[in-house]
């Protein structure tokens, strides 16, 4: 989103006696930030602290196991995606504090705000990959025994990253800095100018590929997985269900406001009242989406506590237990406790 419109009302008729002192805010916005911006700043601060520390810890735990444990490969890649996005937060935070002034230049404008979209696509594609892995473990255990290896997992992750980069390119290309004449301010945002159709196309593709299609496919995928695990009376299936639902739900819940406002704005005139209202909420929607970047480590810890009873172990060992247990593939009849547990621990991805 981030198109170039933050609203102030238009007052009355031309009045030459209405000249103001240049030191006073002339567009009827005070020097205090709007409530949505303040909330966004609070969320950004929390996400940065939890996201950087949490994902760094996850990377540290999984990096050592990634050579031999496929689950570790999944969680390592997810954590890297989240960690990278968190690195942009101090800049985005600073910009909001300065009333959306962007003093960081054109390259930073193209790259940094695009990181959250890269994260969205990378996360959902990695989650789809993980879900396919879960599905195959349940329904094609013999195939998994023969072909499911670390090499294939890394290839799948590389494909997911490649596709994510490709899908982020349109937003990256249309990001520009614009310097407003009065009040003097440099803004960073997307500018499609003449091409409203292209703006709509980008928004629709983002909604479909980054939200609706994954929502549909992952819902179907996990419905089948859970029905199978229940029918086999697999142990801990309710715990599995809870974790899977929590993980899937977190992605879609936190991206929902961003996706809805984005699609609405692409179909509205930039000067319409609804558009201007949605623009006020833009930073808040972005910050809400950013919660995805810190939620996974929290889910891992909560899941780990669930499996271990009380939190008796250290955080790294707890995470190691959750993230690096390898799924044991047996005959499909004996869909093992280990597989079910691993799913619970985070099929998590979604």
């Amino acid at each position: 989103m981030d198109s170039f419109n933050y609203t102030t009302p238009d007052y009355g008729h031309y009045d030459d006696k209405d000249t103001l002192d240049l030191n006073t805010p002339v567009d009827k916005t005070s020097n205090t930030l709007r409530v949505p911006d303040i909330l966004a700043l609070v969320i950004f601060a929390v996400v940065f602290l939890v996201g950087v520390l949490g994902n760094a810890l996850v990377v540290w735990v999984t990096a050592f196991e990634a050579k031999r444990t496929i689950n570790a490969i999944w969680f390592l890649n997810l954590a890297v995606a989240d960690f990278l996005s968190c690195l942009a937060l101090p800049i985005l935070f600073t910009s909001i504090v300065q009333h959306h002034h962007w003093p960081f230049g054109g390259a930073a404008c193209s790259i940094l705000p695009s990181l959250i979209l890269l994260n969205m696509y990378a996360s959902i594609l990695l989650l789809a990959t993980i879900s396919a892995d879960r599905f195959l473990l349940v329904f094609k255990p013999i195939w998994c025994q023969n072909f499911r290896g670390a090499g294939l997992a890394w290839i799948a992750c590389a494909v997911a990253w490649g596709l994510a980069l490709l899908l982020t390119i349109p937003s990256f290309l249309y990001r520009v800095v614009r310097e407003e004449y009065f009040p003097p301010k440099v803004l960073c945002g997307v500018d499609y100018s003449h091409d409203k159709r292209r703006e709509r196309a980008v928004a629709i593709v983002r909604l479909v590929l980054g939200f609706l299609w994954p929502l549909l496919t992952l819902t179907i995928c996990y419905t089948f997985i859970l029905l199978r695990t229940w029918s086999r009376r697999a142990t801990r299936s309710t715990k599995t269900l809870k974790v899977v639902v929590a993980v899937v739900a977190s992605f879609f819940i936190f991206w929902l406001p961003y996706q809805v406002t984005g699609i609405m704005m692409s179909f509205l005139e930039p000067s319409s009242p609804t558009f201007l209202l949605l623009k006020k909420l833009d930073s808040l929607c972005v910050s809400f989406a950013y919660i995805n970047c810190c939620i996974n480590p929290i889910i891992y810890v909560v899941a780990g506590q669930g499996f271990q009873g009380r939190l008796r172990k250290s955080l790294p060992s707890l995470l190691r237990n959750v993230l690096t247990e390898e799924s044991v593939v047996r005959e499909s009849k004996s869909f093992t406790r280990s597989t079910v547990d691993t799913m619970a621990q985070k099929t998590q991805a979604v």
């Epitope: 170039f4 419109n5 933050y6 609203t7 102030t8 238009d10 007052y11 009355g12 008729h13 031309y14 009045d15 030459d16 209405d18 000249t19 103001l20 002192d21 240049l22 030191n23 002339v26 567009d27 009827k28 916005t29 959306h100 614009r178 310097e179 407003e180 004449y181 009065f182 003097p184 301010k185 803004l187 500018d191 499609y192 100018s193 930039p270 000067s271 201007l276």
Partner: antibody
């Protein structure tokens, strides 16, 4: 009413400098920006830069950085533009233009009558 | 810089006719406060430009109601409903949304 009275025409030699004045009346000089615009036949209108008389803050178009210098004297409500190292390319009509700043609108509303600068040896 | 493209370059009209001048910008002129700072000026021979329309569609004080402005985003139009002799001259569109403020190349309104 708002008036911007510019200094008279100038005939100057290449390499020399010229300083044009613009006396404002009929409004609070410090509360609006003063812009300078260049007009050459067949070249349209070009924004040179602006000065905020209240604090002396200036902003120039990239093309005129180092070429034009804007100043303002609050006591006499007069804005000045000095153009240096003149060439035939600088032969033009130069306008001072008030940029009105109010709670309702930002617009270049009143223009001076223009100062013709001719660069010739 | 924002490029302002005016069409036509020259507009021959008969007195009493309607005239329409188009102005297109290379970037959106919607300001971050939601307003669009697109203005129209008329410059008569030997005079300085005079403001006619500010912020797309607002007539400046003393401007007759036969002048009207419209448009949004990047496409704008100035209409003169019934051209009078005093309307002849060069019309410029201008934007003051972005740095630097820029002007269209001008449209010369002349008698057919």
């Amino acid at each position: 009413q708002v008036q911007l009275q510019q200094s008279g025409p100038e005939l100057v030699k290449p390499g020399a400098s010229v300083k044009i004045s613009c006396k404002a009346s009929g409004y609070s000089f410090s509360s609006s920006w003063m812009n300078w615009v260049k007009q050459r036949p067949g070249k349209g209108l070009e924004w040179i830069g602006r000065i905020s008389p209240g604090d002396g803050d200036t902003r120039y178009s990239g093309k005129f950085k180092g070429k034009a210098t804007l100043t303002a004297d609050k006591s006499s409500s007069t804005a000045y533009m000095q153009v240096t190292s003149l060439t035939s390319e600088d032969s033009a009509i130069y306008f001072c233009v008030r940029f009105l700043i109010t709670s309702t609108r930002y617009v270049m509303d009143y223009w001076g009558q223009g100062t013709t600068v001719t660069v010739s040896s | 810089d924002v490029v302002m493209t005016q069409t036509p370059l020259s507009l021959p009209v008969s007195l009493g006719d309607q005239a329409s001048i188009s102005c297109r910008s290379s970037q959106s002129l919607v300001h971050s406060n939601g307003n669009t700072y697109l203005h129209w000026y008329l410059q008569k021979p030997g005079q300085s430009p005079k403001l006619l329309i500010y912020k797309v569609s607002n007539r400046f004080s003393g401007v007759p109601d036969r002048f009207s402005g419209s448009g949004s985003g990047t496409d704008f139009t100035l209409k003169i409903s019934r051209v009078e002799a005093e309307d002849l001259g060069v019309y410029f569109c201008s934007q003051s949304t972005l740095v630097p403020p820029t002007f269209g190349g001008g449209t010369k309104l002349e008698i057919k």
